[in-house]
């Protein structure tokens, strides 16, 4: 049988190594070789290439290799495939070297921000010894902040045969590491280098980008003083590398500047007493190069009503974040406060809190929530300078089991009834929200019988016990996850009831 | 249209020199090989010299080699054959052809070269 | 260097079909492609065959073109022969030796 004609025919010219060519297919059942036949020196020479069965193994490919190996050029490339039943021959292709062309890639070997030239990064490179040395190159710079997996791409073209070549990548952020590389091609090749190795690079320093600033309102103390926490951090969007020196504070009563207060701190955080006024409050952090743009904040009055317009909110889960959703009455809100901290039975260690715009919803990786914790979550709708009402949830990024089973107790103790009382499982060891509670009991001997009630409820009267019996009693909580026994208790109902016994006695 | 035409042919005498031009139109003259083929009278086809596209290679066959030069002007898209040291051998008909990808693809009308005392 | 050796004339009849063979003396026929070419008296020649077995658009699908490896020689075949056929045709190949095209010597065809 005849050998498959030779088809997808696809060639690559490796500068000053080798023109290759492959094909299809790649294996014949049957002893078979090939023979590429080339024209080339725009079709003046012709030569031939062999692939041998017996020492090639059928491989589907072919090299020409230098000196005859001419650029620019035009070749034809024709495979004839045969066996010992006949010749197969492809149709010819035709193979243009500068559109086949793949160069090495460049060498970058420097990365440094240009002084007193902001956000711009001056890549240096030279250019491939085995390039055409005439030709234009285009080339692919790719590059990331050092923290994100995410590349972005720039493409331009360099005519010039300098060796030493550079390109000014501007429009980056300040003060931050890039990781750069650059591949590069003949201008009119379909194929690229590959990528070059990597180089670090830092923009400039400039004064800090601006803050984001919250604050916790407390309850007034008993001399009227209102303790305020104020927080602030780096905004969204602000260098990575970004490092204050240092923040400075200033805030008074609404309409009365005279009152102006200063503080000075290094730290992120900071409590104010205020009266129970209106307060305008303004941060700033600074480093060597200057300040940030000013950071307000309106504390309301003590007495001051707040709008109200969040109707709803929920927490669900995907896969690998916790998403909240809440809906809004006030279209005109765009801009809102999260909040979110363990609840916890003591003081939260960890208070965090973010703004977001433009959207009614809040998204958090599960990994930077601990698993089994529950978690208060509290959105602020912000208006302007004005603080809404919060709209609080709890959510749990994973349940599990709860670390202990209730603490349970028989009162009340009668002939035929008992009636069972439990402790709420402290919040640290619950793991979970608590779906219900099942009572487990059963006589010396007997059948188990159970009982399950909703979580709001922590005392049970169980009724038709068999009177002057042991029995044995546990109460499980349960979460999504499972549940957990209590502690095991043991009673005994009574012969005759107290109720019967007096009355008797008084007859 | 692709056209290729030959002048500069004639009589002259052995161990004269004689220079034939070909005026190319109608494609990119400098994107092909060029080549200068001859026939004796009543003979066969009788390659005698090529060259490529920039000119800087040239290929001339051995009996013609050192009296013959190939040349080329991209600019009036020309071609040159200079011919020195002519034998009588040498008569015959000159065409002027270009190389396409795969066979000479297109020819001249031909000059006639005579070489007699 | 190689040549190509045809023979000097070949005849055939009106309609009948004739096969031009052309042998290259050494190396393979099929290391490098065979051209074939066609001229009229008085005029310069046109390729009819071109890449052992391709055809030129223009030229009738009456022309074909094959190599055979076992007698190491391109054959020209003309089929339905019409008159306008009487004429020279030429082998040619490229010889990487010389760095250069080589012809044959040529085959009259007669139409009879």
């Known amino acids: 049988v005849l050998p498959a004609k030779p088809e997808n025919i696809s060639c690559i010219f490796y500068y000053e190594e080798n023109f290759t060519c492959t094909w299809s297919p790649e294996k014949e059942a049957s002893y078979t070789w090939y023979k590429v036949k080339r024209t080339y020196s725009y079709g003046y020479k012709s030569d031939i290439c062999s692939t041998d069965n017996s020492t090639r193994g059928n491989h589907a490919s072919c090299s020409f290799l230098p000196p005859t190996i001419t650029n620019p050029d035009n070749y034809t490339i024709q495979v004839e495939a045969q066996n010992a039943d006949g010749i197969m021959k492809s149709d010819i292709t035709y193979w243009n070297l500068d559109a086949i062309m793949k160069i090495e890639p460049p060498e970058i070997f420097s990365v440094k921000s240009v002084l007193g030239i902001k956000r711009m990064l001056q890549i240096k490179w030279i250019r491939p010894v085995l390039a055409p040395h005439s030709s234009t190159l285009k080339y692919t710079l790719r590059f990331r902040t050092i923290n994100s997996a995410y590349w972005m791409e720039v493409n331009f073209t360099k005519e010039d045969i300098d060796r030493d070549e550079t390109y000014n990548l501007t429009e980056l952020q300040a003060f931050t590491e890039y990781v750069m590389t650059l591949r590069c091609a003949p201008a009119e090749s379909m194929f690229w280098s590959g990528w070059s190795q990597e180089k670090v690079g830092t923009t400039e320093e400039e004064a800090p980008y601006g803050l984001d600033l919250w604050r916790v309102l407390k309850p007034a103390m008993v001399d009227g003083r209102r303790p305020v926490q104020l927080m602030w951090k780096k905004a969204t969007g602000a260098p990575v590398l970004e490092k204050a020196l240092g923040y400075n504070i200033w805030y008074f009563p609404e309409n009365n500047t005279n009152l102006t207060e200063t503080v000075n701190t290094t730290n992120q955080t900071h409590e104010l007493y205020l009266g129970g006024k209106t307060y305008w409050v303004y941060v700033v952090s600074y480093n060597s190069l200057g300040e940030s743009p000013v950071a307000t904040l309106r504390i309301p009055a003590l007495n001051e009503k707040t709008f109200q317009c969040i109707e709803a909110m929920q927490a669900c889960l995907t896969q690998d974040q916790l998403v909240v959703e809440w809906q809004s009455s006030a279209p005109e809100v765009d801009t809102w406060m999260v909040e979110w901290f363990p609840d916890v039975d003591s003081e939260p260690s960890s208070f965090s809190w973010e703004s977001v715009s433009q959207a009614r919803n809040w998204t958090i990786q599960k990994d930077e929530l601990k698993p089994l914790w529950c978690y208060n979550i509290s959105v602020y709708p912000v208006l302007r300078d004005r603080v809404g009402q919060p709209y609080s949830t709890q959510a749990y990024v994973q349940e599990g089991i709860p670390s202990a089973g209730p603490v349970t107790q028989a009162d009340s103790i009668g002939v035929k009834t008992v009636t069972i009382t439990w402790k709420e499982i402290p919040k640290s060891k619950r793991n979970g929200f608590i779906k219900n509670y099942t009572i487990f009991y059963q006589a010396e001997d007997g059948k188990e019988f159970s009982k399950t009630v909703n979580s709001n409820i922590l005392q049970y009267r169980l009724e038709s016990l068999t009177r002057r019996t042991s029995y044995s009693l546990q109460v499980m909580a349960s979460t999504n996850a499972g549940g957990t026994n209590g502690t095991k208790i043991n009673f005994k109902t009574l012969s005759i009831s107290h109720h019967h016994h007096h009355h008797h006695h008084h007859h | 249209e692709v056209q290729l035409v030959e002048s500069g042919g004639g009589l002259v005498q052995p161990g004269r020199s004689m220079k034939l031009s070909c005026a190319a139109s109608?494609?990119?003259?400098?994107?092909?090989?060029m080549a200068w083929v001859r026939q004796a009278p009543t003979k066969g086809l009788e390659w005698v010299a090529s060259?490529?596209?920039?000119?800087?290679?040239?290929y001339y066959r051995d009996s013609v080699k050192g009296r013959f030069t190939i040349s080329r002007d991209n600019a009036k898209s020309t071609l040159y054959l200079q011919m020195d040291s002519l034998r009588s051998e040498d008569t015959a008909t000159y065409y002027c052809a270009r190389h396409g990808t795969l066979y000479f693809d297109y020819w001249g009308q031909g000059v006639m070269v005579t070489v007699s005392s | 260097q190689f040549t190509l050796t045809q023979p000097k004339s070949v005849s055939g009849s009106l309609r009948s079909t004739i096969t031009i063979p052309c042998e290259r003396s050494?190396?393979?026929?099929?290391?490098?492609?065979v051209s074939w070419y066609q001229q009229h008296l008085g005029r310069p020649p046109i390729n009819v065959i071109y890449?052992?077995?391709?055809?030129p658009s223009e030229v009738s699908d009456r022309f074909s073109g094959s190599i055979d490896s076992s007698s190491n020689s391109a054959s020209l075949t003309i089929t339905n022969l019409q008159m306008d056929d009487e004429a020279d045709y030429f082998c040619q190949s490229y010889d990487s030796n010389i760095d250069g095209p080589v012809f044959g010597g040529g085959t009259k065809l007669t139409v009879l």
């Open positions: 060259i490529s596209t920039g000119g800087g290679n040239t």
């Open positions: 890449a052992d077995d391709q055809r």
């Open positions: 050494s190396g393979d026929i099929g290391d490098s492609y």
């Open positions: 109608g494609f990119t003259f400098s994107n092909y090989y």
